[in-house]
């Protein structure tokens, strides 16, 4: 059986093509995100109180792409935008310069292949998430190993160091 570590997550670079307010939820955005596939993915994010709508447009983000799609207030969300998070503040993680939609995020010490879809019953995401943090340089890490786009660099929060990621 595969180890439960960050290699199980399908983390990819995406570009938000459009973002709008969710029609039925004041705290949610609905985004169309290019992740290097034939069609964009619809993503629902609870970022309204943290990121102005205009800052969501054409933004490069990191997406968790193998969560089981789930309806959020009636809209099917097909991925999750990764953010540094504390009770007071949320910052969208930024990919390295030169990243393009579809680029995979890898972890030097954890070389496995991601699951096609994370089995919600096995709570794999829930077991991995507590070990996701930004470090003292705001670099996104799993157990201290950076989120890396090979040949391009590491992913970062803007200002949030030693913070959780979700």
């Amino acid at each position: 059986s595969k180890p439960i570590d960050v290699s199980r997550l399908d983390l990819r670079i995406g570009c938000i093509i459009t973002a709008r307010k969710h029609p039925d939820a004041d705290s949610l955005y609905v985004e169309e995100v290019d992740v290097g596939e034939i069609a964009p993915r619809t993503v629902v994010s609870g970022l309204v109180n943290h990121v102005p709508l205009e800052q969501m447009q054409n933004r490069m983000v990191i997406l968790l792409c193998n969560l089981k799609p789930a309806k959020m207030r009636g809209v099917l969300s097909q991925a999750m935008v990764m953010c540094a998070s504390s009770p007071e503040k949320i910052e969208i993680l930024a990919p390295p310069n030169g990243s393009v939609p579809g680029d995979r995020i890898t972890f030097d010490a954890f070389p496995g292949e991601p699951d096609k879809e994370l089995n919600p019953k096995k709570k794999i995401w829930e077991q991995i998430q507590p070990d996701l943090h930004t470090n003292d340089e705001c670099v996104a890490t799993y157990k201290g190993v950076p989120f890396e786009v090979k040949g391009k660099g590491v992913c970062r929060a803007q200002t949030m160091s030693n913070s959780g990621i979700k």
Partner: antibody
């Protein structure tokens, strides 16, 4: 493998200056904050200085005991970190360690001895 | 500055017995994130220190599961069950909540 190798230690008199260096290899140096920690003979560990990375404007932080006398700097092109020590005092006598830390991954050099005595 | 105070061990500790090292901080190290910003280090004789535990209770890579960290916002314990020869050295707690970073004075573990 990760290596941090300090150099430049030695014997100096009070009020004199010394610059110690740390050569890093085996990890992406430009992405890592770097620290100096010292240990006086027979004593405990004392944090001395920290320098952040380029995206964080190479911001520096110092212990009160060395503020205004010590300067930490780095050269990402050479994977080097430095500690310039001016107006040295006898109480600065210590083993100086170069270190970097990111949760599970914790790197320390072997240390370099600095002795300040008249 | 945050002051870190470590307790002494009744030295030496008999081989195979457990040892508990205590550390107190002058200010709570519990961050609003729910994490406690405390590290534990071991410095073996003649060696550089190395990290054992971060976030108060998370073992670093390669650290034996005989070591465990626990505590509250200001009172912390590092427990070593079934002490072995490789555990000998000086143990330091360190806070990384705010600058300046501060260490405890160290607790020496010797084995009988």
């Amino acid at each position: 493998a990760v290596h941090l190798v300090e150099s430049g230690g030695g014997f100096v008199q009070p009020t004199e200056s010394l610059k110690i260096s740390c050569a890093a290899s085996g990890f992406t140096f430009s992405d890592a904050a770097m620290y100096w920690v010292r240990q006086a003979p027979g004593k405990g560990l004392e944090w001395v200085a920290r320098i952040r990375t380029k995206p964080n404007n190479y911001a520096t932080y110092y212990a009160d005991s060395v503020k205004g006398r010590f300067t930490i700097s780095r050269d990402d092109s050479k994977s080097m970190v430095y500690l310039q020590m001016d107006n040295l005092k006898t109480e600065d006598t210590a083993m100086y360690y170069c270190t970097s830390w990111s949760y599970d991954f914790d790197y320390w050099g072997q240390g370099v001895m600095v002795t300040v005595s008249s | 500055d945050i002051v870190m105070t470590q307790g002494a061990l009744p030295n030496p500790v008999p081989s195979g017995e457990s040892a508990s090292i205590t550390c107190q901080s002058s200010k709570s190290l519990l961050h609003s994130s729910g994490k406690t910003y405390l590290n534990w280090y071991l410095q073996r004789p003649g060696q550089s220190p190395h990290l054992l535990i971060y976030w108060m209770s998370t073992r670093a890579s390669g650290v034996s599961d005989r070591l465990s960290g626990s505590g509250s916002g200001t009172d912390f314990t590092l427990k070593i069950s079934s002490v072995e020869a490789e555990d000998v050295g000086v143990y330091y707690c360190q806070q990384f909540l705010e600058y300046p970073l501060t260490f405890g004075s160290g607790t020496k573990l010797e084995i009988k």
